[in-house]
Amino acid sequence: GPVWRKHYITYRINNYTPDMNREDVDYAIRKAFQVWSNVTPLKFSKINTGMADILVVFARGAHGDFHAFDGKGGILAHAFGPGSGIGGDAHFDEDEFWTTHSGGTNLFLTAVHEIGHSLGLGHSSDPKAVMFPTYKYVDINTFRLSADDIRGIQSLYGDPKENQRLPNPDNSEPALCDPNLSFDAVTTVGNKIFFFKDRFFWLKVSERPKTSVNLISSLWPTLPSGIEAAYEIEARNQVFLFKDDKYWLISNLRPEPNYPKSIHSFGFPNFVKKIDAAVFNPRFYRTYFFVDNQYWRYDERRQMMDPGYPKLITKNFQGIGPKIDAVFYSKNKYYYFFQGSNQFEYDFLLQRITKTLKSNSWFGC
């Protein structure tokens, strides 16, 4: 069956049952997710706005899928297997009386079962398993998954240490002063510089030595990790972020709805599957897109590619290339190109490299 193809999963509580305090609902749902994260490499984070992987809904009767609830008793809840859209979502029948204890229907116990479905588990034939199809109250203070539950979920996602065996574990923060550090994408955002790497970004505020590391998902929960290119149009308060053949638009630090969109809407030919780096030059009002050993130039006013492109990077940016990882614009005259652990300050008026630096030189290393 389907599984989530990532380890960082977001959830959102769409609405709250009036049967319980909001804090108790939040706690029950958080603890239910924790039951599964304790035995897998999965990490769950709650978001309050935007599109979460798993939407938690309290509803009665017909509620937007084929599986209308049936009033009190009978079906308590249902959840969809991993996937986009309704995939992963967990629906709880509002006609039940939801509680924190043994009276009514215990939300925590029901949520553990439903989240099991949200993660891809089917029902178990073991009566001791939480994935057994019928509800039975057990003491929530001593509740534990059965061996069958653990076997089932670990067959899908591995054990908690599984992600540490990956060659580049997506749960470890890269060492900022590692001389071999490279970046996936770099862009200015107002007076700050964002450096993207894996699922992290560092924030450098101009002229201040201090930098802070953050999860991309903590600022923009709906965005993926592994951003590959980024550029800013400061006059419009817009930042464009690229991964694979998609891009996201951030306005005033908020993700715009209806994204991601295809990079081909910029006018790239079909063979372009991803962007390596991008930079906007406000003097010319043009964006430069770097793809392998070539680059395109895009007119942001006319919203179309300039004719005569692509061109070779090495031909028009002396000393740069053949490929680059990241680039940003600064101080009205420089592009900062990143290639692996090296960085090149490039004066685009003189059309030459003016300084060679380590990629992490911005961090006082």
Partner: antibody
Framework: EVQLLESGGGLVQPGGSLRLSCAAS????????MHWVRQAPGKGLEWVSG????????FYADSIKGRFTISRDNSKNTLYLQMNSLRAEDTAVYYC???????????????WGRGTLVTVSS | DIQMTQSPSSLSASVGDRVTITCRAN??????LNWYQQKPGKAPELLIY???SLQSGVPSRFSGSGSGTDFTLTISSLQPEDFATYYC?????FGQGTKLEIK
Amino acid sequence: EVQLLESGGGLVQPGGSLRLSCAASGFTFSPYWMHWVRQAPGKGLEWVSGIGPSGGPTFYADSIKGRFTISRDNSKNTLYLQMNSLRAEDTAVYYCAKDIRGPYSSGLFDYWGRGTLVTVSS
Amino acid sequence: DIQMTQSPSSLSASVGDRVTITCRANQSIYTYLNWYQQKPGKAPELLIYAASSLQSGVPSRFSGSGSGTDFTLTISSLQPEDFATYYCQQAGIFGQGTKLEIK
């Protein structure tokens, strides 16, 4: 490439019966919910029926409940719609459509067949 | 029972125009709304699912938004091939359709 091919349509008299088939290829048929959707001439789309991966549960629109039966044969990768007690208002193009996999249906129809025309007329 | 009301039922527009079609549910359906395009004599095709997610292969001029009860399908710049009928849908309920015609 996902393909759905309906067959079995034709002209039938009111009160008569017809069995539609939908042959699926290009994907593993058995884990997916499947549906029938119809469209009367010049009208909009109307969902008719849906069936779970292993032949249940089944759902029906009120307009056809008790007259139509949806079924599937996973070994033949085929979906069926048995239509009895046909009425003039059942005249339509009948499409089969694929949904997501899993125990519950999303009602998200990502692939459709080309349709087969059923005409109920005396 | 849930009902879907789609508007307008027909719409005339020109190539290059920005077009918006709306769909309203009589109760919350969260983001469980899909949009389909159907051309004469053809089967419908999925454009947008889960209110705002673009189906693979669909041009980015199509976008969807909304949650709860109010949803919109927007075509940012109409192309000749976009003249068709558009349907919103949630589980077993389709909107009445919007026929988009050349002005």
